[in-house]
């Protein structure tokens, strides 16, 4: 950056190089150029010469004043007009930053995604700080009282192998940057209570032409958790409101759920699961679309699918999966 240049003088910022956004700041430039009594001192911000709020303090020093500085980053440098020099002479440069102290981290959440081998901890960092902000995640065993600390810039994945202090832990997060430090409340966790089952996937749909046509949704998961509670939500694509069905599920075979839907309408389905009685849900699965026929039966599928663990039977049809911005991970 600009800070790596060879200086013929000195540039400094008051109150500091990193300061609170919206502050008034002063940038000082002091020339120390051999055989040069500067006629004029110039300031540049991001390569553009500043024209206003420059005050000459003495023969070698000038000040640039900014009111309510709101830029997160700027590269400043100053130059001197020396007698007998055609070009301005570079004095020095400095990168400056403005931002905010961190908010108190809240909504600290730790989950173990089944088979991941990690405990993933996240939190709400609050408002954007604009400056480099680091987080220290503290994990303290309630059994051994041993504490481990993990430094990160956002969330953290902690290998479950490193959690050797039993099953119960306290977790809290410290946020720190050049402008301040804050600490979250402590979260108490039990490792057995924070497991999120392997993702549930809707594989295909078919509408059976009967007296009252019914749509069967086939869905599955890799989970080996025995007691799993799931929700399937569905709506016509033209609707805003979701309908939700709840299921107690054992994924030893592909699940089949029946719906009585309106004919000739495009529906969208999503599923999510949690270990029964536990706190955290999976994110909603990818959107799965199925258009009900007017009268003729129809099958919709993402792929060919084994109907049980060992059967080898497959059902062929059309792919319809889509990713969506509505796939928010509301695990709370």
């Amino acid at each position: 950056g600009i800070t790596n240049i060879n200086c013929s003088g000195h540039i400094w910022v008051e109150p500091a190089t990193i300061f609170k956004m919206g502050m008034n700041i002063s940038i000082y430039c002091q020339a120390a150029i051999k055989n040069c009594q500067p006629r004029k001192l110039h300031f540049y911000k991001n390569g553009i010469k500043e024209r206003f709020q420059i005050t000459r303090i003495n023969k070698t020093t000038a000040r640039l004043w900014y009111k309510n500085f709101l830029e997160p980053h700027a590269s400043m440098y100053c130059t001197a007009e020396c007698p007998k020099h055609f070009q301005e002479t570079l004095i020095c440069g400095k990168d400056i930053s403005s931002g905010y102290p961190p908010d108190i981290p809240d909504e600290v959440t730790c989950v173990i995604y089944e088979y991941s081998g990690n405990m993933t901890c996240t939190w709400n960092a609050g408002k954007l700080t604009y400056i480099d902000t680091k987080y220290v995640v503290h994990v303290k065993s309630l059994e051994t009282e041993e504490e481990q600390q993990y430094l990160t810039s956002s969330y953290i994945n902690i290998s479950t192998d490193s959690l050797q202090g039993g099953k119960k832990y306290l977790v809290w997060v410290q946020a720190a940057n050049a402008l301040g430090m804050e600490e979250s409340k402590q979260l108490q966790i039990h490792l057995d209570d924070i497991v999120i089952p392997s993702a549930a996937v809707i594989s295909r749909a078919e509408t059976i032409n009967a007296t009252v046509p019914k749509t069967i949704i086939y869905w599955d998961s890799q989970t080996t958790i025995e007691k799993v509670s799931c929700e399937m939500r569905y709506k016509a694509t033209t609707n805003q409101t979701w309908n939700v069905k709840e299921f107690d599920t054992n994924f030893t075979y592909v699940q089949q759920s029946e719906f009585y839907l309106e004919p000739n309408i495009k529906y969208v389905f999503q599923v999510r699961c949690q270990e029964t009685g536990k706190r955290y849900w999976q994110p909603w699965s990818s959107l799965f679309f199925h258009k009900t026929p007017e009268t003729v039966p129809q099958v919709t599928s993402k792929a060919f699918q084994h109907d049980t663990w060992n059967s080898g039977l497959t059902v062929a049809s059309i792919s319809t999966g889509h990713l969506t911005s509505d796939n928010r991970g509301d695990i709370g």
């Epitope: 990818s286 993402k302 792929a303 792919s319 999966g321 889509h322």
Partner: nanobody
Framework: EVQLVESGGGLVQAGGSLRLSCAAS????????MYWFRQAPGNQREWVAR???????SYADSVKDRFTISRDNAKNTVYLQMNSLKPGDTAVYYC???????????????RGQGTQVTVS
């Protein structure tokens, strides 16, 4: 259609080694995670190991430091190197995969038929 075919099972003495392979074929755009599970008669299905597309791995405690999962993305194949085998490892070993069959991100779960591993 996507098929997963396991091979490499057999009878081995306690303390011995086996290497299982599982090859996926068919309409495959991309395979994300690949897994090994096992099931002994009268027991629940048990997860053994998982490997991500980027080769991140995780293992069940019961096999950690004895089994190694690996994969060859170009061949759509996953392997399970099993060392220091114990009678308690006797089971049918299944591989499974989270497969994208198209470019739109839709994932589907596929499972193999399994291969018998017997440790005497």
């Amino acid at each position: 259609e996507v098929q997963l075919v396991e091979s490499g099972g057999g009878l081995v003495q306690a303390g011995g080694s086996l290497r299982l392979s599982c090859a996926a074929s068919g309409t495959i755009f991309r395979i994300e995670n690949m897994y090994w599970f096992r099931q002994a008669p009268g027991n629940q299905r048990e997860w053994v190991a998982r490997i991500s597309r980027e080769s991140g791995t995780s293992y069940a405690d019961s096999v950690k430091d004895r089994f190694t999962i690996s994969r060859d993305n170009a061949k759509n194949t996953v392997y399970l190197q099993m060392n220091s085998l114990k009678p308690g490892d006797t089971a049918v070993y299944y591989c499974t995969a989270d497969v994208q069959t198209n470019s739109r991100g839709a994932q589907q779960i596929f499972r193999g038929q399994g291969t018998q591993v017997t440790v005497s």
